[in-house]
């Protein structure tokens, strides 16, 4: 057993033209965090395949807001080490994947938005217990500087953390302070004992009696934060020389709090407030099991049967995140079809459908022929998955619900006057023409070319008074029809509005629930 440790020194635009000015999008401020993934062997594995050796997520870095006209600074990074514990032997050869993620803090519907900014993959050989290895990697226009190492946790020792070093009660041939290591009884090994007083948070040692400082800390016991930074060279976290170190304004700067714990300064020290499921001086101990209820919003916890095992959360609809803590705007997936309005009520999605559509997702078109949606005697004509209405005389529109003006097309020929009527239209023909549409000329001798057709009306015709009477009746009928239509429409609208108010009231109640 042991721990793989990764220290991110810097992440920012690489040298050269075309380097990005800011990691944030135009939508506003953002902050960075890192994910490390370890896979055994040197094979080029897909980033999506399991991180068989383990994975870790850093805390969120400070909020970064781009300053207009200002040069792109070093980006503020999350504090502290990323630690990936491994339970079995350290494989020696491994793939290291480091992802830089951006969390946008603008006005996102449903909370912050995450996007992958850069991913670097390295295939490496590394012995456990060795010094920090340093690296610079490019990912597109970005540059990442980091150091890493693998160390065993007692009683495991050795380059693969496979040998167990146990104190023995029997006298041994080892010298003072040394102890025999199984399986070789005559092999003695001392875990490195750091210099007395060496900071547990900011220092470490590879040889007994030394105290080597992490990035941002200096002094014989690594207690002194470095106050200035002029450059960032390739020195690793074991560097104790001045320069090329990240500034550290206080005891919380090195982020001694692991697992997303928040650090607060106390006189001469710090205090960690740990998130749910973590405890210890630096929130380094996870005692979470499913019985602790680590999944928020009713999420289902799987695993965690024993205190050492991890758990995963299976989230309810509308939530995501490792602990189901992040709300998803399910309406962003546009589940409502045919222009329906989406409402995320938290415990359910509701689609408010446009007129003519129904169903949980407004997927049913009420205006199909099966619904006989053609009004006023219209005939439904289907074809190619769509439908249309062939309307009766005097009606139009998609569903034949609109009154059509039969005179709009000017059906009366030769200057005939058109009058609309419930049963259709009537043409009053100009002198010299006759027929239903005034389409036939009358012969000069007064004999029609088509004697079977009823003659049109001419001035001085004895039937003229009768026609005028008909026209007056038609006009009165039209006015009466319009009045009836307006009244019935108002009644319908009042009924619809009443139903809509009731529906909105119900939705308001559900949203409040």
């Amino acid at each position: 057993a042991g721990v793989f440790e990764l220290q991110i020194h810097s992440f920012g635009p690489g040298p050269g033209p075309g380097a990005p000015r800011s990691p944030c999008s135009a939508r506003g401020p953002c902050r960075l965090f890192f994910r490390v993934c370890l896979k055994p062997g040197l094979s080029e594995e897909a980033a999506e395949s399991p991180c068989a050796l383990g994975a870790a997520l850093s805390a969120r870095g400070p909020v970064y807001t781009e300053q207009p006209e200002a040069p792109a600074p070093d980006l503020p990074l999350p504090n502290g080490l990323l630690q990936v514990p491994f339970r079995d032997a350290w494989p020696g050869t491994f793939s290291l994947i480091i992802e830089t993620w951006r969390e946008e803090l603008g006005d996102q519907i449903g909370g912050p938005a995450w996007s992958l900014l850069a991913r670097v993959t390295r295939r490496r050989r590394l012995a456990a217990g060795g010094p920090w290895a340093r690296d610079i990697q490019r990912a597109g226009a970005w540059e990442l500087r980091f150091s890493y190492r693998a160390r065993c946790e007692l009683p495991a020792v050795g380059t693969a953390c496979t040998r167990l070093c146990r104190p023995r009660s029997a006298p041994s041939r080892c010298g003072p302070g040394l102890r025999p290591c199984a399986p070789l009884e005559d092999e003695c090994e001392a875990p490195p004992v750091c210099r007395a007083g060496c900071s547990l948070e900011h220092g470490f040692c590879e040889q007994p009696g030394e105290c080597r400082c992490l990035e941002g800390w200096t002094g014989p016991l690594c207690m002194v934060p470095v106050s200035t930074s002029s450059c960032l060279g390739l020195r690793g976290p074991s560097s104790t020389t001045t320069g090329c170190l990240v500034p550290g304004p206080g005891p919380c700067d090195g982020n001694p709090c692991a697992n997303g714990g928040s650090c607060s300064e106390t006189p001469g020290s710090f205090e960690c407030t740990c998130p749910r499921g973590f405890y210890g001086l630096r929130c380094e101990v996870s005692g979470v099991t499913c019985a602790d209820g680590p999944c928020f919003n009713g999420g289902l916890c799987v695993g965690g049967a024993d205190p050492d095992s991890a758990y995963i959360c299976h989230c309810p609809p509308g939530f995501q995140g490792s602990n189901c803590e992040k709300r998803v705007d399910r309406c962003s997936l546009q589940p409502c079809r045919n222009g329906g309005l989406c409402l995320d009520l938290g415990h359910a999605l509701r689609c408010r459908c446009r007129a003519g559509f129904a169903g949980p997702r407004c997927e049913h078109d009420l205006d199909d022929c099966a619904g006989r949606a053609c009004a006023n005697g219209g005939t439904c004509v289907e074809g190619g998955g769509a439908h249309r209405c062939s309307c009766a005389l005097g009606f139009g529109g998609r569903n034949c619900r609109e009154r059509a003006d039969p005179c709009a097309a000017r059906p009366c020929a030769h200057g005939g006057r058109c009058y609309a009527h419930f049963s259709g239209l009537v043409c009053a023909c100009a002198p010299g023409y006759m027929g239903a549409r005034c389409e036939f000329p009358v012969h000069p001798d007064g004999v029609s070319a088509l004697p079977a057709a009823p003659p049109g009306l001419r001035p001085g015709d004895p039937q003229r008074a009768g026609v005028i009477a008909v026209i007056v009746v038609v006009v009165i009928a039209i006015v009466a029809g319009i009045v009836v239509l307006v009244i019935s429409r108002k009644k319908r609208m009042a009924k619809y509005e009443k139903a809509e108010i009731k529906e909105m009231g119900e939705m308001h109640r559900e949203l409040n629930a």
């Epitope: 749910r276 019985a291 209820g293 009713g298 289902l300 916890c301 359910a348 949980p360 997702r361």
Partner: antibody, heavy 117, light 107 residues
């Protein structure tokens, strides 16, 4: 070991009231949504209602069939959730289970409620 | 509310045989379906969540599949302790609803 133990069931006349309790052990009770699910004799399962956490202002939700008659409450300090049943009907006769979470992962052994004249 | 229809109502099989239980939803529920087992006189027990994931401690002979409206619970080789009533439940839309159950009995 996680345990949910229901109690308070019994025989009651139509229109009467009953209060069921569910005592939890082996879990950090205050972190769990709690539900009541019932099962009528020789019938399937029916969700009755749910109470969420203190951080959710102890929000409650109920099935339409019991809305206005049943009330769920919880006492985190006692690791207990309650179901207050008023205006009971014969169709409320069932075994009542308490369960946890959105997905009903842990279940109690149930308590029988019989509504009969 | 979403309606779940389970079939068959009863399945008569012998130990060692394969059991296939069906659950159909009245509308799309994604993969938000769970399966529960209930033995006589006992409370239900969660077997499968998310349509195809075995819950903690559930033997590998139980498997779930499906998405949308059609779901299946398969018991690859029936053990004597598997004879019970199985319910599917949907958790896509609130309130959660259950199917009427399938009784797996010894032939």
């Amino acid at each position: 070991e996680v345990q949910l133990v229901e109690s308070g069931g019994g025989l009651v006349k139509p229109g009467g009231s009953l209060r069921l309790s569910c005592a939890a052990s082996g879990i950090t009770f205050s972190n769990f949504w709690m539900n009541w699910v019932r099962q009528a004799p020789e019938k399937g399962l029916e969700w009755v209602g749910q109470i969420r956490l203190k951080s959710d202002d102890y929000a409650t939700h109920y099935a339409e069939s019991v809305k206005g008659r049943f009330t769920i409450s919880r006492e985190d300090s006692k690791n207990t959730v309650y179901l207050q049943m008023n205006s009971l009907k014969t169709e409320d006769t069932a075994v009542y289970y308490c369960t946890t979470g959105y997905y009903f992962d842990y279940w109690g052994q149930g308590t029988t409620v019989t509504v009969s004249s | 509310n979403i309606v779940l229809t389970q079939s068959p109502a009863t399945l008569s099989l012998s130990p060692g045989e394969r059991a296939t239980l069906s659950c159909k939803a009245s509308e799309n529920v994604g993969t938000y379906v769970s399966w529960f087992q209930q033995k006589p006189g006992q409370s239900p027990r969660l077997l499968i969540y998310g349509a195809s994931n075995r819950y903690t401690g559930i033997p590998a002979r139980f498997s779930g599949s499906g998405s949308g409206t059609d779901f299946t619970l398969t018991i690859s080789s029936l053990e004597p302790e598997d004879f019970a009533v199985y319910y599917c439940g949907q958790f896509y839309s609130f309130p959660s609803t259950f199917g009427g159950g399938t009784k797996v009995e010894i032939k």
